[in-house]
Interface confidence: low
């Protein structure tokens, strides 16, 4: 399908002008290529009428132009002094007329209505309010005032000053007669319907002395605003319906093939399941205006959208509406990124979030979509640090890999973390994206001890076990803070032969702190990555305590939380109840080693990756 988009139907009246805007993907090639407006003939050929290269056909000379706006990816065709002959089928497009990078536009120019002299024309959108002004002379001040609608040759009474109201206008019309001295009465019609369209006659008095005034009421369906957005991107519909419906329920609906309108979201709590996790209705401002944000745009989201107000929260005739025609461009600048990321309970996820690469300095955010009521998205983390304290130690936003993508890591997953999350920046709002986190059955790949208690001044060694499939990945330990995760100095992993015969049970990357200080208390992450792309992480909390005074019962200087079927013995080692340890390496993986001896390398914190056979039980 062509990525060029414009208005499907344009209608106007003889003598008037039209302005037709066409959209195209703003790639470098498209921005500089020829733009055209052509008319389709009976043969199927499309004859150029005006182009961006300065060509104007003789038929359009002096009354038409084409202006390209390359920075917006749009061009506009203006045509003035329209005649009935201009009605027909046209194309706006890029490149060569026959190439197919175009959009079909139907133009209909109708004859203006033959109106009696002195007719006042009122042009109002459907659902809105019109005030018809009716002047009269002093002698008709005490006499009956009335408004008629002309239907063919007859006049049908709509309202009069004797309290008559035509049933078609019940509860939405009033006649106002001013105080003495003002020689004008007004008729106010609310919630205009398309059927209200037509010629009206104001009348004051009767007989040959009566005052009459013609009024032509043109009730228009709102011209849909064209909205051109990228696949996977985001759109915002701003809906301003006026103060008169400020306290009425609001909705956004999409017009279907039957020309009825299916509710997408409303303020009464209804939401189309197709938009689950990717829609927000921002609560309305005092003036009754509101906005709806939809992210993760799909091709099937294309169509005509209406926003409106009605106590039922859905479209009803005669209530104000606003319209948009949404086109979703498949030649998207927004890169593909997973819309679903799966993790296991206790494990982690690393989510890639796209942003406009031209806005590398923009603030980055991640929020959790909440579906209650109209939906909202509390921020969890931003590029300057953590926002929600309950995510301490398990959530971090990283600027890597950069150049249009940032990373969010969430670990210590539970089933409650399942849900929809939004990637945001304070820049280009069209780059908002949605990702769903699903928690599936399985075990975390990285294994670390439970919480660890370290002793001041001594050496702490924390193991992180990884499976063979990660042997080619870069392993790291980092210390978490609410502004990120600071990688700790890493030692070489040793000769590559060590990984050739990968023993599924023997891969360790160890963190050594020597000597332990008060500042070492906190969360540490063990993780794997490939270049700037992050994989799984596992978190461990290190608490720091004073050395026990002589005479007190001895407990291992650095102990991991005992698993449910283990007990910590006074000797500082674990006994696994009712289980024979057949392979000492299995125990070594779980052992947190404390050593008061000097560390050979002399560095305070180091990371070592080796097999447990190489590591043995000693601190490196």
């Amino acid at each position: 399908k062509s990525p060029v988009f414009g208005p499907q139907e344009v209608s106007s009246v003889e003598g008037n002008s039209v302005s037709i805007k066409c959209y195209y993907p703003p790639t470098s090639v498209n921005r500089h290529t020829r733009k055209y407006w052509c008319r389709k003939g009976a043969s199927g050929r499309c004859i150029t009428l005006v182009s961006s290269e300065g060509y104007v056909s003789s038929n359009y000379a002096g009354r038409a132009n084409l202006t390209n706006f390359p920075e917006n990816g749009t061009f506009v065709v203006n045509i003035a002094q329209l005649s009935r002959d201009d009605s027909g089928h046209y194309k706006c497009g890029l490149g060569i007329n026959s190439r197919g990078l175009s959009f079909d536009v139907s133009l209909e120019v109708s004859q203006g209505p033959e109106l009696p002299n002195g007719t006042e024309v009122y042009t109002v959108d459907v659902g809105r309010t019109v005030t018809i002004k009716c002047p009269f002379k002093t002698e008709n001040a005490p006499k009956t005032k009335a408004l008629y609608k002309k239907i063919g040759q007859t006049s049908v009474l709509v309202i009069d000053s004797r309290n008559y109201v035509n049933p078609n206008y019940k509860d939405r019309i009033r006649l106002r007669i001013p105080g003495t001295g003002q020689l004008i009465f007004t008729v106010v019609i609310d919630r205009l319907r398309l059927s209200d369209h037509g010629l009206y006659l104001c009348q004051a008095g009767d007989g040959s002395n009566r005052d009459e005034k013609n009024a032509d009421l043109q009730v228009l369906e709102p011209e849909p605003e064209l909205v051109y957005e990228d696949l996977r991107g985001s759109v915002t519909f701003h809906c301003a319906l006026g103060l008169e419906v400020a306290n009425v329920a609001k909705f956004l609906c999409r017009v279907n093939s039957r020309e009825t309108c299916d509710v997408v979201i409303n303020t009464l709590g209804k939401r189309d399941s197709a938009f689950e996790g990717r829609i927000l209705l921002n609560p309305q401002d005092k003036d009754g205006s509101f906005s709806v944000v939809i992210t993760g745009l799909r091709k099937e989201d294309e169509g005509r959208y209406l926003c409106g107000a009605h106590s039922d929260g859905q479209l009803q005739e005669g209530w104000p509406i606003q319209a948009w025609q949404l086109f979703v461009n498949e030649e998207s600048t927004i890169p593909r990124s997973p819309t679903v990321v799966k993790g296991v309970a206790g494990g982690s996820v690393a989510v890639l979030c796209p942003y406009n690469p031209k806005e590398s300095q923009s603030l980055k955010y991640w929020c959790l979509w909440e579906g209650a009521q109209n939906g909202r998205c509390p921020l969890l983390v931003e590029s300057q640090g953590l926002v929600q304290e309950q995510y301490e130690g398990r959530l971090s936003l990283l600027q890597e890999p950069g150049n249009g993508t940032f990373t969010v890591i969430l670990n210590q997953l539970t089933t409650q973390d399942a849900g929809f999350y939004w990637c945001l920046t304070n820049g280009d709002t069209r780059w908002r994206t949605t990702v769903e986190i699903k928690i599936i059955e399985g075990e975390p790949n990285l294994k670390v001890p439970g919480n660890v208690t370290a002793v001041l001044g001594e050496t702490l060694n924390i193991p992180c076990h990884f499976p063979c499939k990660f042997s080619s990945y870069e392993k790291y330990w980092c210390k978490w803070s609410n502004t990120g995760c600071q990688t700790l100095p890493s030692q070489d992993e040793g000769p590559s032969e060590a990984f050739v015969n990968c023993d599924e049970n023997s891969r360790l990357v160890s963190l050594t702190l020597n000597p332990v200080t008060r500042a070492d208390e906190g969360w540490y992450w063990c993780g794997v990555k490939q270049g700037h792309f992050y994989g799984e992480t596992a978190a461990v909390y290190v608490a720091v305590e004073e050395k026990k005074v002589a005479g007190s019962r001895y407990v291992s200087p650095a102990k991991a939380d005992a698993a449910p079927d283990e007990k910590v013995l006074d000797s500082g080692v674990r006994e696994i109840e009712n289980k024979a340890i057949q392979d000492p390496r299995l125990f070594a993986e779980e052992k947190v080693v404390a050593d008061t001896g000097d560390q050979a390398g002399g560095s305070r914190a180091s990371v070592d990756s080796s097999s447990s056979e190489e590591q043995g039980g000693s601190s490196k």
Epitope: L280, P283, D285, F290, Y365, C367, R376, C377, L379, L424
Partner: nanobody, 124 residues
Framework: EVQLVESGGGLVQAGGSLRLSCAAS????????MGWFRQAPGKEREFVAR????????DYADSVKGRFTISRDNAKNTVYLQMNSLKPEDTAVYYC?????????????????WGQGTQVTVSS
């Protein structure tokens, strides 16, 4: 969590002006929607004004429109409420509030962080 401290309240004659300040600590507020609310004795806490994180969008209660102006200085981590043409009915405790919600408009329920309040008394 962000801590908010209001200052600038006091006693002023009707028609006078006051400028309230709300200083934030604990974290930067340049991503927070910030607002001012007030509570008169025996009444519910009511919305006065709010400003989005960039300062580009503001909103006011009808009762203060044209008289009060909300502004922010993200570099100083501070939000201000300039109150002109004060009336006796403006007498209340004024609270500063912050919201980390990504939302175009916030009610008092959406504000997670609150200051202790500063008393404004307008005498006739």
């Amino acid at each position: 969590e962000v801590q908010l401290v209001e200052s600038g309240g006091g006693l002023v004659q009707a028609g006078g002006s006051l400028r309230l300040s709300c200083a934030a600590s604990g974290r930067t507020i340049n991503t927070y929607v910030m607002g001012w609310f007030r509570q008169a004795p025996g009444k519910e806490r009511e919305f006065v004004a709010r400003i989005d994180w960039s300062g580009s969008s503001t909103d006011y209660a009808d009762s203060v429109k044209g008289r009060f102006t909300i502004s922010r200085d993200n570099a100083k981590n501070t939000v201000y409420l300039q109150m002109n043409s004060l009336k006796p009915e403006d007498t209340a405790v004024y609270y500063c509030a912050g919201s980390a919600y990504y939302s175009g408009y916030v009610t008092h329920r959406d504000f997670g962080s609150w200051g202790q309040g500063t008393q404004v008394t307008v005498s006739s």
